[in-house]
Interface confidence: low
């Protein structure tokens, strides 16, 4: 037999919350358990599903879960079936709804002194209790002129008057929870004694010294009062006008007329209507003085033929918004065609050369009119007046290449040299007419030049080759003063270039011939062995047929190059002692000796008492200090050459003799002791 160990039982449940109907069976063989709701099998869903043999509810639903549930256990082999006791839910819920008009049938039928009934469509189980609100303030039962029927969820206003006007809402609460109306009801019951707007004043814009009219009307029973105020709350009446509103008139119908309006009259005007009962109604309107600013200037425009272009006219700031139109040759442009106005834009489609000229943008409003011209140029492709020609330019002189063109607008000319843009600097200058000036022609200026003349419509270009006529010159010019070492071989070069390869020869300045041990080999003066007699003035002469000759004078000095007889040695000196750095040099002319210490030249006139440079070139430093340490350089120089040699100077503390050392122990390094 099938036995129910646990049977489902009726229970309270909360709408939307979890619940479980328990069912457990015991049987000799396998059984399958299913559930019935009001006799129909229960299908599993995500919300309601079998959990073992129990039935689980993820969220109880008052509509889908109302009825009688039964647990059925069936042995499919024997056909035996057992059913549990019935179980149902007592589902607690509350659901919001709107506040609706129950009586009369429509809002149009609501009149003063009629009965008005409102219904609160909040429902629930157990039945909730209701609370009504007007404009957010609770209404309690038993107050005058209204009754609340909790059973029928109604609020009755008997009789309804203007004082009942407002926004009605309701809330309800029960053991399950609380809800408030999803949509509220606005009750509007007119009171004939309240002022109502018939005609409201509008903002006006007027030109200076024109007139302005504001209309304002209210209705009520008995008729309401009407008053006009200006910004500073000064009342405006025909009897008492503020000083700045002397020309104001208030008509019997409530309209306000202002004549010969001035800037001080601009501002906010308030029209106030007051009924016998109820609040005052304040209406506002603003008087604006019309104005128009100046228009911004247009940049001249350059367009190309065949293109489509637009010119936007930005309207000037103004009140009211200025209207804008374009004119050309005194005629207003149409809104369609080839040249036309579109919005604030001037549109030129498929531009022709004849479209060039002055176009005028006009803007106007009550305050006046403004205009601004734009000059439109239709660009043409440049044409040649004079192309650049292949030219021969003389080295060292200015050279000119023409590039004369004409077009509208004036064309821009740029020059290229070997395909590289020439930028103006100290050597190149492009004149306004396009001519290129090379200020001082150099040999490497001999190349291809190209000029390009451009306008927005297009460009033309031409090129020319420049050949540089080289001047006769020394390359490089010989040094005017040179030294040769006595009893050694020496060469003095001289080379030159010109339009034709020049011949080069040397001569002595006094005209005497060169000794046999001196040869002139293609411009190089060669001394097999320099003697004292070779000193003197020499002239290098370069010449060719077309350019004549040039001369360079050279003074040759014969010298015995410098050698050091005595060089300074690495020296270590006790602090406070005297250091001697010896240096002697020989040469012809007799060399002068200078010392450099710690990277600065030691000026004999500014050495101070501790340092001295002897006639023979030796440097002595008395009372040496640690800061005297460093490298000292002896520099020997004459008019022909210069040599240097250096040695370090170390200044050390005098050691204190240790007891173990005898009185005559030598120092551990080479010392100068004084």
């Amino acid at each position: 037999a099938i036995v129910f160990i646990k049977q489902p039982s009726s229970q309270d449940a909360l709408q939307g919350r979890r619940a479980l109907l328990r069912c457990e069976v015991e049987a000799p063989g396998p059984v399958h358990v299913y559930w019935l709701l009001d006799g129909a099998p229960v299908q599993d869903t995500e919300r309601r599903f079998a959990q073992g043999s129990s039935l689980s509810f993820a969220a109880v639903d008052r509509l889908q879960d109302s009825g009688t549930f039964q647990c059925v256990a069936r042995d499919d082999v024997t056909g035996e079936e057992a059913r549990s006791a019935n179980a149902s839910f007592n589902i607690k819920w509350i659901e919001a709804g709107p506040v609706v008009l129950k009586h009369p049938a429509s809002e149009a039928e609501i009149q003063p002194q009629t009965q008005v009934t409102l219904r609160c469509h909040i429902d629930g189980h157990p039945r909730p209790t209701y609370q009504w609100f007007r404009d957010g303030t609770p209404l309690s039962d038993g107050q005058s002129n209204h009754t609340v029927s909790s059973k029928e969820r109604n609020l009755t206003l008997r009789p309804a008057g203007p004082e009942h006007s407002g926004l009605y809402s309701c809330c309800a609460h029960s053991a399950f929870g609380q809800a408030c109306s999803s949509q509220n009801f606005t009750l509007s019951i007119a009171d004939e004694s309240f002022a109502r707007v018939v005609l409201a004043p509008q903002d006006v814009v007027v030109a200076r010294y024109e007139e302005a009219m504001f209309h304002c009307q209210f209705s009520a029973q008995p008729p309401p009062s009407l008053q006009w105020l200006f910004e500073d709350e000064t009342p405006i009446t025909n009897r008492s006008r503020p000083p700045h509103l002397r020309r104001a008139t208030v008509f019997a119908n409530g309209s306000l007329l202002l004549t010969q309006v001035r800037p001080r009259n601009a501002g906010i005007y308030r029209c106030i209507g007051q009924g016998q009962r109820g609040p005052p109604i304040i209406l506002e309107a603003t008087l604006h003085l019309a104005e128009i600013e100046d228009m911004p200037l247009f940049e001249p425009r350059v367009f190309t033929a065949g293109s489509e272009e637009r010119v936007t006219c930005l309207p000037p700031k103004g009140l009211p918004e200025p209207s804008v139109w374009w004119e050309h040759a005194g005629v207003r442009l149409p809104t369609h065609g080839r040249v036309y106005q579109k919005g604030h834009e001037l549109v030129l489609a498929n531009i022709a050369e004849s479209d060039a000229g002055v176009y005028t943008c006009h803007a106007a409003n009550l305050a006046g009119q403004r205009r601004q011209d734009v000059n439109i140029t239709v660009a043409t492709v440049p044409s040649w007046l004079k192309k650049p020609q292949d030219s021969q330019l003389e080295e060292g002189k200015p050279g000119y290449l023409d590039c004369l063109t004409q077009a509208t607008p004036k064309p821009t000319v740029v020059w290229y040299r070997n395909q590289m843009l020439i930028s103006e600097d100290s050597r190149f200058e492009v004149f306004k007419n396009g001519t290129l000036r090379i200020n001082s022609v150099e040999v490497y200026d001999g190349t291809w030049y190209r000029c390009m003349s451009s306008t927005p419509a297009g460009s033309i270009e031409a090129q020319a080759r420049v050949q540089v006529l080289e001047k006769l010159k020394f390359t490089p010019p010989p040094q005017p003063q040179q030294c040769m070492e006595f009893d050694k071989e020496a060469t003095v070069p001289c080379s030159a270039t010109g339009r034709e390869k020049p011949t080069i020869k040397w001569e002595r300045a006094d005209g005497s011939s060169l000794p046999e041990w001196v040869t002139d080999n293609a411009g190089t003066l060669h001394f097999a062995r320099v003697t004292r007699d070779d000193a003197g003035n020499y002239t290098c002469i370069a010449s060719n047929g077309p350019q004549g000759q040039i001369r360079a004078h050279v003074q040759l000095t014969v010298a015995v190059f410098i050698t050091f007889k005595v060089e300074p040695e690495r020296t270590t000196v006790y602090q406070g002692h005297t250091a001697l750095l010896q240096c002697e040099a020989q040469g012809d002319p007799k060399p002068l000796i200078q010392w450099k210490g710690k990277d600065r030249i030691l000026d004999p006139t500014k050495l101070g008492p501790r340092m001295h440079i002897f006639q023979n070139g030796s440097l002595v430093i008395h009372d040496v200090a640690p800061e005297d340490s460093g490298r000292y350089t002896c520099i020997a120089g004459n008019s022909c050459n210069i040599k240097h040699t250096e040695a370090p100077l170390y200044v050390v503390d005098k050691p204190v003799p240790e007891e173990s050392e005898g009185p005559g122990s030598p120092p551990p390094y080479k010392m100068i002791q004084t």
Epitope: S423, E424, D425, S426, R427
Partner: antibody, heavy 120, light 111 residues
Framework: EVQLVESGGGLVQPGGSLRLSCTAS????????MSWVRQAPGKGLEWVGM???????YYASWAKGRFTISRDTSKNTVYLQMNSLRAEDTAVYFC??????????????WGQGTLVTVSS | EIVMTQSPSTLSASVGDRVIITCQAS??????LSWYQQKPGKAPKLLIY???KLATGVPSRFSGSGSGAEFTLTISSLQPDDFATYYC?????????????FGQGTKLTVL
Amino acid sequence: EVQLVESGGGLVQPGGSLRLSCTASGFSLSTYAMSWVRQAPGKGLEWVGMIYINDNTYYASWAKGRFTISRDTSKNTVYLQMNSLRAEDTAVYFCARDIGISYYIGVSLWGQGTLVTVSS
Amino acid sequence: EIVMTQSPSTLSASVGDRVIITCQASQSIGTRLSWYQQKPGKAPKLLIYGASKLATGVPSRFSGSGSGAEFTLTISSLQPDDFATYYCLGEYSYTTTAGIAFGQGTKLTVL
């Protein structure tokens, strides 16, 4: 409005390639010399190369062989093709107009730059 | 290739100070030199061109001088907006080569 807008920057692995674009608006690229300039994070400006209106190209010595500048006048765009990228190529790359002759005409126009990061 | 050497690389100054930045080219470039100002995250802005000409919209307290290989940028009376990095730019062009070189920059900071 006359302006230059660079694009194509991003993260690339060492040894990889990237092509930057610089699109001009408000003027025609075909009539101007265009340069690429780069700036490594926290470092100074460094010229990469330029293309003249006759399509001649010039490069900084370090960029020769790896970087190529070209342009498509129909698209009003100049390009910088960067190959064999290294970590030290990480920089903001600017496209600039006229800087080669700014000393002469007193005007130069720059884009806002695009960041190239070379990292593994 | 040309090399542009700027000095100093950093410079601290106060509002109202007179500031001088120098730029040396490794070879003569005539007056083919411009000065640029750059603020963080922005593109450079042209200040001086042709070594000494003031670009449009640049205050007159900025001035440039020099030619050949030695150039200077002077700010006569430093303003708060002038704290930025300044670069010189040299241009060279010959028949076989052309190019541009920037100085390494001078960062101008508040003292």
